[in-house]
């Protein structure tokens, strides 16, 4: 059974069949006699009740408000009301891209590794009984596939497979032909096997500090998604209330790996924070890598060669 239309803000492309299904549907069947009403408001118009007479494009069935099809002027707020239950949606109907078989904003993308198995399947369970054929297009060129009910691609990926795949379902309603499009963007990349994680920068860092001031030690690494980065310091981590581990930040690289950074913040630096090791470690199934920071009083810096300093 399909779920209800639970998202309160919805964007849809003009010219396609569309429906809103309220989320108290099971309840509605129990109270068949209860008055159920659909309303629309947009701009100056406040709560206009919808019924099949409002527009030849609108159909009402039990829990569903259908549009055959949805048009730009359907943009607005919609309300379903039944006893003390109300559900509201904000519908934004956007222009169809007249120069393409799909509208860019409605695309979902995934990365597939070369030589790995991937698939595209065309399904639409809500309109399933009304669909009389479905076509699959690649970059808006129709693919000749055996099954015209649920066309499918199942294969090991090659670089030539990269592109936009559009499933177009054709259906009849009241003697008119409609179509619904869903587009997938497939990007083919080189094999993305796990890398050996690496911490960025020198292995030993002397940091010049002043007593009573604060310092932020930044530890950055290139790692796999499941790898972890953490700080180790002192006898027992967490025993110094002036030392705080900040939240880890991660950014995905174009190759599907991660650039992670974790900051250790030391506030109100005291003597006990000087000349001790603050270790940052990245750990993976393939091993670990560690880099160390040592806080040195600014006055003592003359004794240390310049090339070992970090800011």
């Amino acid at each position: 059974a399909e779920s209800c239309t639970s998202r309160p803000h919805i964007t849809v492309v003009e010219g396609e069949p569309f429906y809103l299904k309220h989320c108290s549907c099971s309840l509605a069947h129990e109270i068949e006699t209860t008055t159920k009403s659909w309303y629309k408001s947009s701009g100056s118009q406040e709560h206009v009740e919808l019924n099949p007479r409002s527009s030849s494009r609108i159909a009402l069935h039990d829990c569903v408000l259908e549009f055959w099809p949805v048009e730009l002027n359907d943009t607005g707020s919609y309300f379903f009301q039944m006893k003390n239950y109300t559900q509201k949606w904000k519908l934004n109907v956007i222009r169809r891209n007249k120069h393409s078989c799909f509208t860019e904003r409605q695309v979902t993308s995934k990365i597939v590794e070369v030589k790995k198995f991937f698939q595209i399947t065309c399904e639409n369970s809500y309109y399933q009984t009304l669909v009389n054929s479905t076509s699959l297009y690649k970059n808006c060129k129709k693919l000749l596939l055996e099954n015209n009910k649920n066309p499918t691609i199942k294969k090991n990926a090659e670089f030539e497979d990269q592109g936009y795949y559009s499933c177009v379902h054709f259906l009849h309603h009241n003697g008119k032909l409609f179509n619904i499009t869903k587009t997938f963007n497939i990007t083919i990349v080189e094999d993305r096997s796990n890398i050996v994680p690496v911490l960025l920068g020198p292995k030993l860092n002397h940091v010049a500090v002043e007593l009573g001031k604060n310092v932020r030690l930044n530890c950055s690494a290139l790692l796999n998604e499941e790898d972890v980065i953490y700080w180790m310091f002192g006898e027992e981590n967490g025993s110094d209330p002036n030392i705080h581990e900040e939240k880890e930040m991660r950014i995905m690289t174009p190759e599907g790996k991660w650039h992670a950074s974790k900051v250790l913040r030391i506030e109100n630096i005291g003597e006990s924070n000087l000349n001790v090791l603050y270790n940052c470690t990245v750990a993976s199934t393939g091993g670990t890598d560690t880099k160390s920071f040592i806080l040195v009083r600014k006055a003592d810096m003359a004794d240390i060669p310049g090339h070992v300093f970090t800011r």
Epitope: E2, S3, C4, T5, S6, R7, I10, T108, S109
Partner: nanobody
Framework: QVQLQESGGGSVQAGETLRLSCTAS????????MGWYRQAPGNKCELVST????????YYADSVKGRFTISQDNTKNTVYLQMNSLKPEDTGVYYC?????????????WGQGTQVTVSS
């Protein structure tokens, strides 16, 4: 446009656990509900679990209730599927999907997915 990236699959023994991750980029995370589908060899595509990025409400297929937990980390734009007490019948390719309506009626098993193999 939203870009989805699944990971975390693997081979385990029955009773063990796995955690799948799906990271969304290129769009505002809360524009979509996020979910997981799966497909076992020779079987149809099945909706396993979904989560609303607005209020955190969740759905689970009867076959995974009490064993699987879906969660989200909005700061990382990531949804996780924690799979505990895995059974051989959980074997299949798991696909992440984003739905901008919450109706979960338009496909689901597409792309490369992440393979989960559970042996007895």
């Amino acid at each position: 446009q939203v870009q989805l990236q699944e990971s975390g699959g693997g081979s385990v023994q029955a009773g063990e656990t796995l955690r799948l991750s799906c990271t969304a980029s290129g769009s505002t995370f809360d524009e979509y509900d996020m979910g997981w589908y799966r497909q076992a060899p020779g079987n149809k595509c099945e909706l396993v679990s979904t989560i609303s990025t607005i209020d955190g409400s969740t759905y689970y297929a009867d076959s995974v209730k009490g064993r699987f937990t879906i969660s989200q980390d909005n700061t990382k734009n990531t949804v996780y599927l924690q799979m505990n007490s895995l059974k051989p019948e959980d074997t299949g390719v798991y696909y992440c999907e984003a739905d901008d309506r919450g109706t979960w009626d338009r496909g689901g098993c597409w792309g490369q997915g992440t393979q989960v193999t559970v042996s007895s």
